[in-house]
């Protein structure tokens, strides 16, 4: 077992709070598995405190994860039958040993509570519980002390109860009536119907029978049924008030006196000192962590727990480390948030499990109307006007590349850019020089090209401009529509995803 800071919870902290030496104790408390809030303070099945606790002195740099813990086992004896389902409370207490006014100071460091289902005689069950920043690793098991046997520690009952299917004088002391101990060898001749024995060669009588071999009905003795034979020649004595008066056994249990006290023989489905506890049903909520209980409509039928994601065990009591299954692909970071699993993907990957490779056009399309271009084992986005970046998600400054020629001034516009040309130039990018004599504009081409046929050149330029203008107008319409849709979709998705992850991590 171990007790210390949980993983990923920062620097291991000392349990002593830097106030000198301290000791850790564990208090283990067992309650019936169906205990109500009203009996919350009662450890009805038993409680125990750990012993032989070593002193822990904090040393600089020493990891609190290696705390010296109480040696050996914490044994919790239970008097009655083992109920099978129980509540386990483990408290970790710190005793500060330094000089304090009023003696040692005690503080409760951590308290874990959980319902468990466990048969006696089984192997050690391992568990990990986290509370606050502390983590407690422990194992537990239930064992019967002889002569008790079986999963419920059925034992020979020391009571004069009616015979049961277990045989004369034997009855189960648990809600498991099929588990019985072999009967003792009684005095020869002891009535198998009306007598029983707890020790070899004895014969004890069930109620209503008497005699050395329990063969004489009480009604044939000198007293009536309701009276007890007194000393010789004194007639009959009325019985005084006994432990069974008023029948302390609930739920139809039958009471029998045992050495000044009483015992209850409980009907099937009930157990406890006074038969006050019923067998566990789905209505008792035996499944932890919101698990769905199926079956178990009555105490005699078994129930099964269907666990929520992230939990396992017969009662959904064990948290699953789902990240150990490495669900995040391509080196993504796994975050098990309890109620959900999240993958934080490396650059170049996306998807719930980082399964989409963004360096592959099949993985995800370019945003904002960009087109994906593959080549050389990688991909790039050819972005629409006004957008840039790896996936065309970034709004680009269209004027950054100084697209306006001949000193033209560039203005960014919702659909791209506009050039305000310097005097003597015109065109979308100010690429045409205007002749001072009022002749047609021609491109400001290199000197050697300016002597070419101006008419033919100009017709070509006009055709190009018309095509470009049509393309730009069509592009603007498509771009505005698709950009609005895509921006809304991706921004909403990203903001929501980041907010959700932040919220869940905080939760």
């Amino acid at each position: 077992h171990s007790f210390g800071p949980g993983p990923g919870l920062g620097t291991p902290r000392s349990p002593c709070n830097a106030r000198g030496p301290c000791r850790l104790f564990f208090r283990v408390c067992l309650k019936p598995g169906v205990s109500q809030e009203a009996t919350e303070s009662l450890c009805a099945l038993g409680a125990a405190l750990s012993t032989s606790v070593p002193v822990y002195t904090e040393h600089p740099g020493e990891s609190a994860a290696a705390l010296p813990l109480p040696d050996g086992l914490v044994r919790v004896p239970f008097r009655d039958a083992w109920p099978g389902t129980f509540s386990l409370v483990i408290e970790t207490w710190r005793e500060q040993l330094g000089e304090h006014a009023g003696g040692p100071a005690w503080n409760l460091l951590a308290r874990v509570v959980g319902r468990r289902r466990l048969a006696a005689g089984g192997p050690w069950a391992r568990d990990v519980q986290r509370t606050g920043t502390w983590e407690l690793h422990f194992s537990y098991r239930a064992r019967c002390e002889p002569p008790a046997v079986g999963a419920a520690c059925a034992r020979l009952c020391r009571s004069r109860s009616a015979p049961s299917r277990c045989g004369p004088g034997l009855r189960p002391c648990t809600p498991f009536p099929d588990e019985c101990e072999a009967p003792s060898v009684c005095r020869p001749g002891c009535s198998p119907e009306h007598g029983y024995c707890e020790e070899p060669d004895e014969c004890r009588c069930l109620e209503g029978w008497t005699g050395p071999l329990c063969t004489v009905p009480v009604s044939t003795s000198s007293c009536l049924n309701s009276r007890v034979p007194g000393p010789a020649s004194t007639g009959c004595l009325l019985p005084g008030p006994g432990p069974c008066d008023g029948n302390p056994c609930a739920n139809g249990g039958s009471c029998s006196e045992t050495s000044g006290s009483f015992e209850c023989a409980c009907p099937r489905g009930f157990y406890g000192l006074r038969c006050e506890v019923s067998g566990v049903t789905c209505a008792d909520g035996p499944c932890f962590n919101g698990g769905l209980c199926v079956g178990g409509e009555d105490p005699d039928s078994a129930y099964v727990c269907h666990c929520p994601p992230g939990f396992q065990g017969s009662n959904c009591e064990k948290r699953v480390d789902r990240c150990s299954l490495q669900p995040c692909q391509n080196g993504g970071l796994c975050l098990d948030l309890g109620h959900a699993l999240r993958c934080r993907c490396r650059a170049g990957f996306a998807g719930p499990r980082c399964e989409h490779d963004l360096d592959d056009c099949a993985g995800r399309a370019c945003a904002n109307g960009g087109t994906c271009v593959e080549g050389g084992g990688s991909r790039r986005c050819s972005c629409a006007l006004g957008f840039g970046g790896r996936d065309c998600r970034e709004r680009a400054d269209p004027c950054a590349s100084r697209p306006c020629a001949h000193g033209g001034r560039c203005y960014a516009h919702f659909s791209g850019l506009v050039c305000a040309c310097a005097p003597g130039y015109m065109g979308v990018r100010c690429e045409f020089a205007v002749r001072p004599d009022g002749a047609d504009a021609v491109p400001a081409a290199p000197r050697g090209l300016r002597q070419a046929d101006p008419q033919r050149f100009l017709a070509g330029v006009i055709a190009v401009i018309v095509v470009v203008v049509i393309a730009i107008v069509a592009g603007i319409v498509v771009l505005v529509i698709s950009r609005k849709k895509r921006m809304a979709k991706y921004e909403k998705a990203e903001i929501k995803e980041m907010g959700e992850m932040h919220r869940e991590l905080n939760a």
């Epitope: 169906v34 874990v112 909520g285 929520p308 994601p309």
Partner: antibody
Framework: EVQLVESGGGLVKPGGSLRLSCAAS????????MNWVRQAPGKGLEWVGQ??????????HYAESVKGRFTISREDSKNTVYLQMNSLKTEDTAVYYC????????WGQGTTVTVSS | NIQMTQSPSSLSASVGDRVTITCKAS??????VSWYQQKPGKSPKLLIY???NRYTGVPSRFSGSGSGTDFTLTISSLQPEDFATYYC?????????FGGGTKVEIK
């Protein structure tokens, strides 16, 4: 027999408040997570919120649509869970059900909340 | 949140018919899907959990199947008491979300 009985519904103006109760019987109430689920008229089911157990420090979770306006609490000694609804909007008009567990196995009969001016 | 898309939104069938309702999740939800039945003016009732397991007391004519993103509720032989609205719900990721419902009406 397991029974969940909701109460406290009614007509309220936008911006107003209402407190719903759900009383449980036939179950060991303190062992069950409790949820509120609502159903707008003619619509489907929408999870509203959840409260867990004392051992979970009575942790609560809420749907985005009600976060900051609705509060769930429970009183295990009375086998009752509550839904405090503040700053009510017309879109909160619905039948409100209380349910148990993670998988909503037991349901109450529902109580109607109408938010209208 | 995970979206659950149910189809059809309504259907007409006769007693004895085999009825199939489908539910599609917007992402993988494993087998963490439940089906609920709701009659007019009543609260929903759990029918199927874990995609294919019948809940306590649910008749054997109801069955569920599927995993991942595609799920089906089948009523092998429709009975008069089965005319109701059916909802699927996913419980893989918090918060739980439901489909829009399928109303099964008498033809």
């Amino acid at each position: 027999e397991v029974q969940l009985v909701e109460s406290g519904g009614g007509l309220v103006k936008p911006g107003g408040s209402l407190r719903l109760s759900c009383a449980a019987s036939g179950i060991t109430f303190s062992n069950f997570w409790m949820n509120w689920v609502r159903q707008a008229p003619g619509k489907g089911l929408e999870w509203v919120g959840q409260i867990r157990l004392k051992s979970d420090d009575y942790a609560t979770h809420y749907a985005e649509s009600v976060k900051g306006r609705f509060t769930i609490s429970r009183e295990d000694s009375k086998n009752t869970v509550y839904l405090q609804m503040n700053s009510l909007k017309t879109e909160d008009t619905a039948v409100y059900y209380c349910t148990t567990g993670y998988y909503f196995d037991y349901w109450g009969q529902g109580t109607t909340v109408t938010v209208s001016s | 949140n995970i979206q659950m898309t149910q189809s059809p939104s309504s259907l007409s069938a006769s007693v004895g018919d085999r009825v199939t309702i489908t539910c599609k999740a917007s992402e993988n939800v494993g087998t963490y899907v439940s089906w609920y039945q709701q009659k007019p003016g009543k609260s929903p009732k759990l029918l199927i959990y874990g995609a294919s397991n019948r809940y306590t007391g649910v008749p054997s004519r109801f069955s569920g199947s599927g995993s991942g993103t595609d799920f089906t509720l089948t009523i092998s032989s429709l009975q008069p008491e089965d005319f109701a609205t059916y909802y699927c719900g996913q419980f893989y990721s918090f918060p739980s979300t439901f489909g829009g419902g399928t109303k099964v009406e008498i033809k």
